[in-house]
């Protein structure tokens, strides 16, 4: 902490301008009265301050608003943004897309992940829902942060706004992100044709049911082998040969490849060799021939 | 434009253990294995082993096992080979490559990272 | 695992000469699962040839793929001076990956 002293009469600050950058950090402490700071944060970002001295800056605001920053201030944050931790951050309550916009200009390019995300999440919580302006500023200005949220959070997406999230948007979603955005997704896309259909629900597989991805077989949509590697692995266990081999179509051959990598390797593991043989592809560690498959599960469950 | 981007030279003593990235940019990142090949002095390549960043999953070349650790930090679009308990044998240029899922072959490079194990 | 074997493993041609680097698995391959890289002193390798025959995405026509089985080869129809590099031989058709010990081929 700044140590206190009292201000020599020819420092004392009547207005936030570059005469600041030659303060010392207990100058800036003693002279730089909080309230003034916060009525003219516009001009902060203006002026080189060393982060020295920004540091003094916030630790002058944080006194000011123990509670959390009011709006007014956050906007103006400017630079000032980078020394915010996610716990400063958790104290606000953002709504304007103007200061989210302007925040995550700042923070590009420096390593803040954690504090975006707060950042992101605070907005969601302000604004009572994750809206298509709110969607549409970080696709702009956050490609990937979508993924930033949690699953609650993205809860409360409208399905009429997942048309506005682009397949990069979705890049760094998790399968529990993904299993609350499907279920949107195919209710904002079902009255579109097949083929249409599937371009648009692709990037949002991953949260898909099995019977989906049964029924999506039956459609001729040769599913690339980037798009089948994201499906939830319980989805594609219960796929029998013939459903992936049309639910690829060409892309089939990619099998071989992906062999060893889930959820390829344990849906071979559950597949007659029998079957397996018929792709012609070479896959191995099927159930061998006569060999009688019993499904414990079932069982316990029944006992 | 598709970029894999991987660390400095690294002189490392015989012993400990280094952590080499590879940043991609340009493509969708978990549409694609990232890959990993040593080249000693010049000579010919070899296979360690993949990293799926959709699962985290790795396999690898089994002469690697134990020596090699494949990882990915999707959030940052970055591969992760940590190489341990480092011998003058592990002297070499590593590479990363992307090769896209159910695909074969490497259709971008990152510029390697050469590692020089001596004390 | 497969072990692929290059040769010659160091061979110098003329401007406008024909040559040909051969790759031989120690079991049979799909020919889909042979590709070729090119690399230069203190670059990376590059994509040449994918699926035994077909060129990558820049690669001058004068260069063509062969080969099926245990036995595949990679031609320059007429060697020029940019052609001079390492060409390695790779398969993907069972794990581990492997690689030829390669080719250098010098110009004259």
């Known amino acids: 902490d700044v140590e206190r002293t009292t201000c020599p009469p020819e420092k004392e600050v009547h207005e936030i301008d570059e005469s600041l950058i030659f303060y010392k950090k207990r100058e800036l402490e003693a002279c730089v009265d909080a309230a003034l700071l916060a009525a003219q944060m516009d001009r902060v970002d203006a002026i080189p301050f060393t982060y020295e001295q920004l540091d003094v800056l916030k630790h002058k605001l944080d006194e000011l608003y123990p509670q959390g920053y009011p709006e007014s201030v956050i906007r103006h944050l400017g630079h000032l943004f980078l020394k915010m931790s996610p716990e400063d951050i958790r104290k606000w309550n953002v709504t304007s897309l103007e200061t989210l916009k302007a925040l995550l200009k700042v923070s590009k390019g420096h390593e803040m992940s954690a504090q975006v995300a707060t950042l992101i999440d605070r907005v969601v919580v302000g604004r009572g829902q994750l809206d298509k302006d709110t969607v549409d500023t970080l696709t702009a200005f956050c490609p990937g942060c979508l993924c930033s949220l949690s699953p609650e959070r993205l809860s409360s997406v409208p399905p009429s706004v997942i048309g506005a999230v682009r397949p990069q948007d979705l890049d760094t979603c998790g399968p529990r992100q993904l299993d609350v955005l499907y279920p949107k997704a195919r209710l904002a896309f079902q009255n579109m044709s097949g083929s249409e259909y599937f371009v648009k629900i692709r990037p949002f597989l991953g949260g898909a049911p099995t019977e989906d991805v049964k029924a999506l077989s039956q459609q001729n949509v040769s599913m690339d082998l980037a798009t089948f590697m994201k499906l939830r692995r319980e989805a594609v266990l219960p796929l029998t040969v013939a459903e992936v081999q049309k639910l690829l179509g060409p892309h089939v051959e990619g099998l071989k490849v992906e062999e060893q990598h889930s959820p390829v390797r344990d849906w071979i593991l559950k597949q007659r060799q029998d079957d397996l043989d018929t792709l012609g592809l070479g896959l191995q560690g099927g159930i061998p021939n006569g060999y009688l498959i019993l499904d414990l599960s079932v069982r316990e469950a029944l006992s | 434009d598709v970029q894999l981007q991987q660390s400095g030279p690294e002189l490392v003593e015989p012993g400990a253990s280094v952590r080499i990235p590879c940043k991609a940019a340009?493509?969708?990142?978990?549409?694609?294995?990232v890959d990993w090949v040593k080249q000693s002095h010049g000579q010919s390549l070899e296979w360690i082993g993949d990293v799926n960043p959709n699962t985290d999953g790795a396999i690898y070349n089994q002469k690697f096992e134990g020596k090699a650790t494949l990882t990915v930090d999707t959030s940052s679009s970055t591969a992760y080979m940590e190489l341990r308990s480092l011998t003058s044998e592990d002297t070499a240029v590593y590479f990363c490559?992307?090769?896209?899922?159910?695909?074969?072959?490497?259709?971008?490079w990152g510029q390697g990272t050469t590692l020089t194990v001596s004390s | 695992q497969v072990v692929l074997t290059q040769s010659p493993a160091i061979m110098s041609a003329s401007p406008g000469e024909k040559v040909t680097l051969t790759c031989g698995a120690s079991s049979s391959l799909i020919s889909k699962y042979l590709y070729w890289y090119q690399q230069k002193p203190g670059s990376s390798p590059k994509l040449w040839i994918y699926s035994t025959s077909n060129l990558a995405s820049g690669v001058p026509a004068r260069f063509s793929g062969s080969g099926s089985g245990t036995s595949y080869s990679l031609t320059i129809s007429s060697m020029e001076a940019e052609d001079a590099a390492s060409y390695f031989c790779?398969?993907?058709?069972?794990?581990?990956?492997?690689f030829g010990g390669g080719t250098k081929v010098e110009i004259k």
């Open positions: 790779h398969q993907w058709s069972s794990y581990p990956y492997t």
């Open positions: 340009g493509h969708t990142f978990t549409d694609y294995n």
């Open positions: 490559a992307r090769r896209r899922l159910g695909q074969g072959g490497f259709d971008s």
